[in-house]
Amino acid sequence: GSGIFQLRLQEFVNQRGMLANGQSCEPGCRTFFRICLKHFQATFSEGPCTFGNVSTPVLGTNSFVVRDKNSGSGRNPLQLPFNFTWPGTFSLNIQAWHTPGDDLRPETSPGNSLISQIIIQGSLAVGKIWRTDEQNDTLTRLSYSYRVICSDNYYGESCSRLCKKRDDHFGHYECQPDGSLSCLPGWTGKYCDQPICLSGCHEQNGYCSKPDECICRPGWQGRLCNECIPHNGCRHGTCSIPWQCACDEGWGGLFCDQDLNYCTHHSPCKNGSTCSNSGPKGYTCTCLPGYTGEHCELGLSKCASNPCRNGGSCKDQENSYHCLCPPGYYGQHCEHSTLTCADSPCFNGGSCRERNQGSSYACECPPNFTGSNCEKKVDRCTSNPCANGGQCQNRGPSRTCRCRPGFTGTHCELHISDCARSPCAHGGTCHDLENGPVCTCPAGFSGRRCEVRITHDACASGPCFNGATCYTGLSPNNFVCNCPYGFVGSRCEFPVGLPPSFPWVA
């Protein structure tokens, strides 16, 4: 504690100019005062002035009024500072002395003589109001007032509460009369060191370092930090929780980067071909006859479909083709024969059957041969039966497809799941994507294959309520609560049917 006992001397009357011993002062009583302040005593005794003492210079002769003076020698009121808790009681001894010596430092002069003394004992509360008193004896009268006030930055009824107004990192406050803190606008807390964030700033997702601010924690955005940020890799998606990637309409894939309506948006298929929103690139072109290529952009030779039968040779012309027929055949495609079974037209052991009363014939071919005259060895690969880039190989009476890595099946039509070899560690969930498997990791793990144990597991603190399951999702710093039936909220903290602001008590 810290305070000041103040004594204001107002008037001293010693009309006859007498000393306490009955002698008179020559030429008059040149008066100064000694003040001794000590702890309360029922009977005032000599001894140290435990609360302080002070002397004045000569203030006047015999009778005089003491004027207020704020500085220098002869200051009035007199100041008796203390640095302890004010006890509320005191003893005060005021002595009037005559000095024949120095006006300014009479205390040091020899031959000083006592004029009179008064003793006051009692209680005194801290306060600004002066207590006024007057003491008389046979020869003298003293008028005075006194009070106890607290030093700067000290407050309370015993000046024991320290409070210094501040506006810095450690607090933002002024001091009340009782010494309690009064926070400056925008600040709160015991020491007024907590800023009051922007009204509506989300309690969990936002924070502030100064008033009316709302700074979002990772994964959140917006004025009130109540809107999530999608995943870093997300292209055409949004989120309902941080780092999610929920695809906009028409987009698919883990990062919503696969155009589900590629055909409509980009029209990649040329020359009247049909576009389907499927396949490894997000679309497939089905070409009209006479065209080939990924986008049906390449025109085929008119002879590419082998239109000439019976061994006829094909010649390309500007917008069509021409068949040169071998001996015994005629027609646009060499489809008519001048031969009969008598000419033994069937090769490779084919059987000849007469038609149209012997004017024409038909050959029945043995296995592995074909053509009007059984002249062609069957090539089972001509129909391109192998899908997904598989290689077709003739094996005697049959053919096989040699599949590229990642495909299987008779026609290489089946995609081998990358997930079949269980690449995800620690119970991660595997998703097959075009560029390989992607693992969604359980709480506590991350990495491409869930191989990294997360030291700061967001789920470790058990943030989900009401029996919800916690997942770390796509980012190890954030968690997702999977709510049981009947509960909603980012932490499953609200029962269904109650507004999110309703303080639910289980």
């Epitope: 955005q221 940020i229 999608p230 870093n232 055409h236 906009d248 710093n477």
Partner: antibody, heavy 118, light 107 residues
Framework: EVQLVESGGGLVQPGGSLRLSCAAS????????MAWVRQAPGKGLEWVAT????????YYRDSVKGRFTISRDNAKNSLYLQMNSLRAEDTAVYYC???????????WGQGTLVTVSS | DIQMTQSPSSLSASVGDRVTITCRAS??????LAWYQQKPGKAPKLLIY???NLADGVPSRFSGSGSGTDFTLTISSLQPEDFATYYC?????????FGQGTKLEIK
């Protein structure tokens, strides 16, 4: 493919103004917060400003507050940085980036050079 | 503001070497740390986010580790295209701040 293309850089006198633009493609621009990051010649990277996707809330580094304004036009898939009262210390390559102040900057433009000199 | 300090500021290495760059934060930033690669005259490119997650299309020779205040970027077997400047960045506290960079040069 995500693309961010900045424009509008150039030489300007101290106290002058410039407006940088960033054209975005390859992603749904309106779904994502955006930022400007700068790099003084031969120096490191320094975040400048951010704008949210949801409500257009803006944040600035202290040294540019009151002088720079970040804005966006979702209909045009464009981000802007209006720079007023330019100082010599604002000289830098300014990059447009996808991200907020509390998320990584996942995609960056090629940058546009702003030189403030008399 | 949080200070990010990278070390070393530069280092020389050979193709095939294993290289480690460290980044220290002046206070706890949990796992909210990213690493970027920048080649001369080019824009930075995100390599790693959330301390240890590889960004899309980044080779698996890059990896990140750490938490709290100390973080590491490791390149397991240096390739010719990896010679560049690398920056770390924290996004846990406002404002976001970057390290001063580490220049990786060919020996």
């Amino acid at each position: 493919e995500v693309q961010l293309v900045e424009s509008g850089g150039g030489l300007v006198q101290p106290g002058g103004s410039l407006r940088l633009s960033c054209a975005a493609s390859g992603f749904t621009f309106s779904n994502f917060p955006m930022a400007w990051v700068r790099q003084a010649p031969g120096k490191g990277l320094e975040w400048v400003a951010t704008i949210s996707s949801s409500d257009g809330t803006t944040y600035y580094r202290d040294s540019v507050k009151g002088r720079f304004t970040i804005s966006r036009d979702n209909a045009k898939n464009s981000l802007y940085l209006q720079m007023n009262s330019l100082r010599a210390e604002d000289t830098a390559v300014y990059y447009c980036a996808r991200g907020y102040y509390n998320s990584p900057f996942a995609y960056w433009g090629q940058g546009t050079l702003v030189t403030v000199s008399s | 503001d949080i200070q990010m300090t990278q070390s070393p500021s530069s280092l020389s290495a050979s193709v095939g070497d294993r290289v480690t760059i460290t980044c220290r934060a002046s206070e706890d930033i949990y796992s909210n740390l990213a690493w970027y690669q920048q080649k001369p005259g080019k824009a930075p490119k995100l390599l790693i986010y959330d301390t240890n997650n590889l960004a899309d299309g980044v080779p698996s020779r890059f990896s990140g580790s750490g938490s709290g205040t100390d973080f590491t970027l490791t390149i397991s077997s240096l390739q010719p295209e990896d010679f560049a400047t690398y920056y770390c960045q924290q996004y846990n506290n406002y404002p976001p701040t970057f390290g001063q960079g580490t220049k990786l040069e060919i020996k």
